[in-house]
């Protein structure tokens, strides 16, 4: 069971990143699915290595003082959402913006029906060029 | 099937990074090989988690305006090369240069004879100290 | 065999990061253990994918000129410690400090009784908020 999906620019103002099965994507079988273009949902309980990579372009003057934060989040059936992993990068002083990349990854127990998704502080800063931003998992 | 190889400084001007089976490297068996010191080639079709870490030292004034970009690329038999993953970091203002690290990783389907390699915008900026820059894969 | 542990602030002045089995941690069975809150120790020989993520907050003026470095280190029975992976990030000019995240990961052969741990140049700069700093492994 494995998946690797590719970032997709979205007109939505939500902080949840959007993904697509496009380009060199992976969706090994129907035991993992991409739902609503935003979350990877697994059908089998078990340990999964889950990862995300987010490349963004920001400028200190044009951004809020808070850093750019990417969060890997979990929604389990019947449970509150929770943050699994977070990474933060201070905005660049480069103009018009400076690119930076964040990588998140870890091993987590998922229940049947659990979904994972990626949240960012400012989705408009995310880079969607080939290979820059992606999201995936593999069952151990 | 798993491999982990260690960066090697090169006098070549190519943007493809060079690797070696040295230090605490891994080469589990002959189903994965390091070819020409530059690419990991697999003999078996399947899903692989492929990763690379690149540490580099650059300075904004001494570098081009473009960011430092590391790309994980795929060459399949009879196919054009393609980018699997990329990460970008704007150059530091630290003098003489500021170190930064990039990590790439994802799950991809590889065909028999497929090769993966790592490309960077400026190989002269890559740090080759122990543990700073490495490249590997594991078959799921 | 898999583990994922969560960073813990420590009053110790050691450069070795402290970890805990808290929050959304993973400890699949007793073939991997967290020892003294600082190292993951495995009982079985084999290939392991080992990873760490460290988020830190630093300021160029308040820090030494040397970058922030995170190191993934190995201690095998009867052997000297050795560095497996390192990543470096130059300090930010943001005030009071600028957050940055480092991710390390690779495949390594571990012997029975081998321990892995994470070293940083300044543990006081490490961010311990939910999901920011974690450490884990999985047996291939």
């Amino acid at each position: 069971i494995a998946a690797h999906v590719i970032s997709e620019a979205s007109s939505k103002t939500t902080s949840v990143l959007q993904w697509a099965e496009k380009g060199y994507y992976t969706m090994s079988n129907n035991l993992v699915t991409l739902e609503n273009g935003k979350q990877l949902t697994v059908k089998r309980q078990g340990l999964y290595y889950i990862y995300a990579q987010v490349t963004f372009c920001s400028n200190r003057e044009a951004s809020s003082q808070a850093p750019f934060i990417a969060s890997l989040c979990l929604k389990s059936p019947g449970r509150f959402e929770r943050i699994l992993l977070r990474a933060a990068n201070t905005h660049s002083s480069a103009k018009p913006c400076g690119q930076q990349s964040i990588h998140l990854g870890g091993v987590f127990e998922l229940q049947p029906g659990a979904s994972v998704f990626v949240n960012v502080t400012d989705p408009s800063q995310v880079s969607h060029g080939t290979g820059f931003t992606s999201f995936g998992l593999l069952k151990l | 099937i798993a491999a982990h190889v260690i960066s090697e400084a090169s006098s070549k001007t190519t943007s493809v990074l060079q690797w070696a089976e040295k230090g605490y490297y891994t080469m589990s068996n002959n189903l994965v090989t390091l070819e020409n010191g530059k690419q990991l080639t697999v003999k078996r079709q399947g899903l692989y988690y492929i990763y690379a870490q690149v540490t580099f030292c650059s300075n904004r004034e001494a570098s081009s305006q473009a960011p430092f970009i590391a790309s994980l690329c795929l060459k399949s038999p009879g196919r054009f090369e393609r980018i699997l993953l990329r990460a970008a970091n704007t150059h530091s203002s630290a003098k003489p240069c500021g170190q930064q690290s990039i990590h790439l990783g994802g799950v991809f389907e590889l065909q028999p004879g497929a090769s993966v390699f790592v490309n960077v915008t400026d190989p002269s900026q890559v740090s080759h100290g122990t543990g700073f820059t490495s490249f590997g894969l594991l078959k799921l | 065999i898999a583990a994922h542990v969560i960073s813990e602030a420590s009053s110790k002045t050691t450069s070795v990061l402290q970890w805990a089995e808290k929050g959304y941690y993973t400890m699949s069975n007793n073939l991997v253990t967290l020892e003294n809150g600082k190292q993951l120790t495995v009982k079985r020989q084999g290939l392991y994918y080992i990873y760490a993520q460290v988020t830190f907050c630093s300021n160029r003026e308040a820090s030494s000129q040397a970058p922030f470095i995170a190191s993934l280190c190995l201690k095998s029975p009867g052997r000297f410690e050795r560095i497996l992976l390192r990543a470096a990030n130059t300090h930010s000019s943001a005030k009071p400090c600028g957050q940055q995240s480092i991710h390390l990961g690779g495949v390594f052969e571990l012997q029975p009784g081998a321990s892995v741990f994470v070293n940083v140049t300044d543990p006081s700069q490490v961010s311990h908020g939910t999901g920011f700093t974690s450490f884990g492994l999985l047996k291939l």
Epitope: E35, P77, S115 | - | -
Partner: antibody
Framework: DVQLQESGPGLVKPSQSLSLTCTVT?????????WNWIRQFPGNKLEWMGY???????SYNPSLKSRISLTRDTSKNQFFLQLNAVTTEDTATYYC?????????????WGAGTTVTVSS | DIVLTQSPASLTVSLGQRATISCKAS??????????LHWYQQKPGQPPKLLIY???YLESGIPARFSGSGSGTDFTLNIHPVEEEDAATYYC?????????FGGGTKLEIK
Amino acid sequence: DVQLQESGPGLVKPSQSLSLTCTVTGYSITSDYAWNWIRQFPGNKLEWMGYITYSGTTSYNPSLKSRISLTRDTSKNQFFLQLNAVTTEDTATYYCARSPYYGPWYFDVWGAGTTVTVSS
Amino acid sequence: DIVLTQSPASLTVSLGQRATISCKASQSVDYDGDSYLHWYQQKPGQPPKLLIYAASYLESGIPARFSGSGSGTDFTLNIHPVEEEDAATYYCQQSNEDPNTFGGGTKLEIK
């Protein structure tokens, strides 16, 4: 506004099957949420029976597992309860209700309920 | 199954006073810092209505005179000041473990 409405026979004979329909308006049952059946016995005791999720997976109360089946018709935005081999003990008011699939299983929207009597 | 025991079975409270209803679980309904215990109000001929979820979170549209507290195995629903329209039966429900279970109910009368 989302609304749920139960329908089905008010009287069922012992040993037969009880079939109820919940029609949902104002929200697609395939978009999100878990869609539940809950019953209330004459003494007012409430019992959760089971759910079918937006993706079609089901979960049942173990006390009913051998007798219960939940299905749906997405084209009509309806979900169904079938309870086999009923006895007089199954006499109750049957409610359909919605609960967040991701989030605590509380029941935030209920139907008005339909009373079912099991009697020969 | 987790058994929820409500007390008292019934109570009478004067208008404007405080009503306190207890719900005790046979085992903890906490998970990872959150309490999976919810409260409902039911009036005759109507379905139950969600008041409080996760022990203390007020459902949208519910008056602030309703509040919930507790963790682990002991939970409380408070209504203050009680109004005439609060006459109803109140149920607690746990969702920490399958199957979801309900308490036996507490009937509140206003005098």
